[in-house]
Structures are given as structure tokens and as C-alpha cells.
Interface confidence: low
């Protein structure tokens, strides 16, 4: 009767010596199971059986199209993501036993979310707007309004605002101002136009001169009445408002009539009205 307690005490001492207090926490890359610490399976491998007093943790590599990306005690590997072409997706980076497949969108499309579950068409920038940042597989097109001096006349997901044509560098002048949707229209220089205008001016001046000479001749003709003996022929002083004596107005009118600049100004205002509609 007395032996039993003594045996129990002895066994208890023996067990305490062989099995110290069960751990409550394990080292990094270990896990606690059945009061003992077992090694986790490395990335790319799954758990087959936990460790025992006598055996190590048993792990197996993930199969084809499977992965595990952390130290783990998973009994099943995760399936690689499927890049569904029906959703506009394609493989950007093939998965390994340790990494998942990375999907991206087909050309001209971008992901709807960070997880890239499906795709949407890239936005196009309307006329008057240019592409500030071309879309990527994960972000949409960023548009910006064309500032003064720039234009865009197309709807595009790629084209930036173009600078207005510099008429000066082509030895031309601006005939029609540019807008955010249209380029400037260049025309010939005033110098070139002068080649046409100057002969016209000289022609008019020559005609006026002929008229003056003719009037002078007519004035010098002797009259039927007898002149007063002492009266000498008088030089005729023409008044300033006589037609032809002030050439500025007709020349200016002719120039104005020949100048497309004034006509184009009107044309431009009509175009901008249409654009606002």
C-alpha cells in the first residue's frame, strides 16, 4: 500500500527530468503543436505531418500551378491566379512555387483594382485636352487641358497637346489665331503682300498725276473773251478737298480691301462660335 505513492513520486520526478515544462511560445519559423515546437514548412512547400518527439516536420513541395509564399503549416497550397483573357487579362509574371501569377491588362486596357480582377478601356483625351500621363496596366490615362499656345484636335489616349505652329520661323504671319482645339493659320508676310500693293499705289498716284496735268492744261487754254490787258495768267491753287488731291483715303481703302487679315479676323470669330456649340 505504501509502495504506490512512492512509485508515483519517483515516476513523477523522472518524467519531470525528461520532459521539462511544455513551452508556451516557439522560436521564429516554428509553431506549437501538442505541447512542442515544430518547424514551419518553407515557402513553396506544404505541411504533410507535424513533428513528433522523434521526427521532424514533414513538408512537400507545392504542385504545378500551386504556390505558398510564406513559412507555413498549410496542408494545401494555393492555386495560381488565372489571368482570364475573357476579362482582358494576360500573364505579366508567371507564378512559381513561392509566388503567385501576376496578371495585367491587354494593350489599351487597365486594371479596375489593385488585385487586377478585370480591365477597362483606357480613357481618351478629348479635343482641347492632351495626355498628361499615358495609361499603364494599372492606372488610367491622365488628361490635361491644352494651355494657351497649345492645341489638340483629336480624341486620343496617347497624344499630348501640340504647340501652335510658329509662323515667324517660316517667314509667315498669323492669319488666323489658334485655339485649344485648332492650330494657327499662317499666311504670307506683309512684305510679300507689298509686292502686289505697291504697284497698285503707284498706279493710282500716276493716274492722279495725269488728272492734275490734264486739269492744268485745260486751265491754261485761252478763253473766247478778250483778256484784260494788264491781267496776267494766274496759277491755279486747287483746294485740298478736290477729288484726287488727298490720296491717303483711297489707298488705305484699297489696302484694307486687299488685306485678308481683316477678313480672317471675322472668320475666326465665326469658328469659335461653332466650337462653343
Amino acid at each position: 500500500m505504501v509502495r504506490l505513492p512512492l512509485q508515483c513520486v519517483l515516476w513523477g520526478c523522472l518524467l519531470t527530468a525528461v520532459h521539462p515544462e511544455p513551452p508556451t511560445a516557439c522560436r521564429e519559423k516554428q509553431y506549437l503543436i501538442n505541447s512542442q515546437c515544430c518547424s514551419l514548412c518553407q515557402p513553396g512547400q506544404k505541411l504533410v505531418s507535424d513533428c513528433t518527439e522523434f521526427t521532424e516536420t514533414e513538408c512537400l513541395p507545392c504542385g504545378e500551378s500551386e504556390f505558398l509564399d510564406t513559412w507555413n503549416r498549410e496542408t494545401h497550397c494555393h492555386q495560381h491566379k488565372y489571368c482570364d483573357p475573357n476579362l482582358g487579362l494576360r500573364v505579366q509574371q508567371k507564378g512559381t512555387s513561392e509566388t503567385d501569377t501576376i496578371c495585367t491588362c491587354e494593350e489599351g486596357w487597365h486594371c479596375t483594382s489593385e488585385a487586377c480582377e478585370s480591365c477597362v478601356l483606357h480613357r481618351s483625351c478629348s479635343p482641347g485636352f492632351g495626355v498628361k500621363q499615358i495609361a499603364t496596366g494599372v492606372s488610367d490615362t491622365i488628361c490635361e487641358p491644352c494651355p494657351v499656345g497649345f492645341f489638340s484636335n483629336v480624341s486620343s489616349a496617347f497624344e499630348k497637346c501640340h504647340p501652335w505652329t510658329s509662323c515667324e520661323t517660316k517667314d509667315l504671319v498669323v492669319q488666323q489665331a489658334g485655339t485649344n482645339k485648332t492650330d494657327v493659320v499662317c499666311g504670307p508676310q506683309d512684305r510679300l503682300r507689298a509686292l502686289v500693293v505697291i504697284p497698285i499705289i503707284f498706279g493710282i498716284l500716276f493716274a492722279i498725276l495725269l488728272v492734275l496735268v490734264f486739269i492744268k492744261k485745260v486751265a491754261k487754254k485761252p478763253t473766247n473773251k478778250a483778256p484784260h490787258p494788264k491781267q496776267e495768267p494766274q496759277e491755279i491753287n486747287f483746294p485740298d478737298d478736290l477729288p484726287g488731291s488727298n490720296t491717303a483715303a483711297p489707298v488705305q481703302e484699297t489696302l484694307h480691301g486687299c488685306q485678308p487679315v481683316t477678313q480672317e479676323d471675322g472668320k475666326e470669330s465665326r469658328i469659335s462660335v461653332q466650337e462653343r456649340q
Epitope: 475573357n86 476579362l87 482582358g88 491587354e106 489599351g108 486596357w109 479596375t112 483594382s113 480582377e117 478585370s118 480591365c119 477597362v120 478601356l121
Partner: nanobody, 119 residues
Amino acid sequence: EVQLLESGGGLVQPGGSLRLSCAASGFTFRVYWMTWVRQAPGKGLEWVSSIDPQGGMTYYADSVKGRFTISRDNSKNTLYLQMNSLRAEDTAVYYCAKARIPNLEFDYWGQGTLVTVSS
């Protein structure tokens, strides 16, 4: 199994409005483009409108632009088509379809709902 069930069709006078619904099941609705197509009596299928998975991008046929509005509620797995200013030429069976992209073709569609526009 993919299932698409349209409802909301009926007889309406020219200039009137209707709202079609399409209840989707059997697939992950929120990640798919959805489309409405229609078939007028004695004619072929005509594409009407498409919407992207998030509902942010919509496309319309010229014949319905400005009159029809496509929308979706991903929490209810439901697609909608609000039809305003209806015309006689809008008379057709309207089908809701799960779209394939990028080309917006469709691989599954419902049994359809008839919309008749007549005075």
C-alpha cells in the same frame, strides 16, 4: 451554372419609359463586363450598351445614346437598363449578356424580355 434573368419589359407608349432588370447568378458578377443586346422582330441581334465591372465606364449604340442608361448594382448582382423617350423602333426582345472583353462580345445571355412601343 451561369444564369441571367431579365424582367421589366412590357407595352409602353412612344415617349414613355421602362426600366429593365437582369438578375445574375452562377459567376462572379462584379468582375465581368455586362451588356444589353436586343432583337427586333424579324431582325438580327443589335448591341445596345455595355458597362465595365465597376460601373464607371459605359458605352452606347448611337441609336440609343442620350435616351438609355445602363447601370449595375454589384451588391445585388443586378444589371439595369433605364429606357426613356422610347420610340417604335425600340420595340424588341432585350437580352442581358455576360460580356467577353476586350472586344465586348458576349458568351452567356438570358431568355430576354419583350419591350413593345406602340400607341
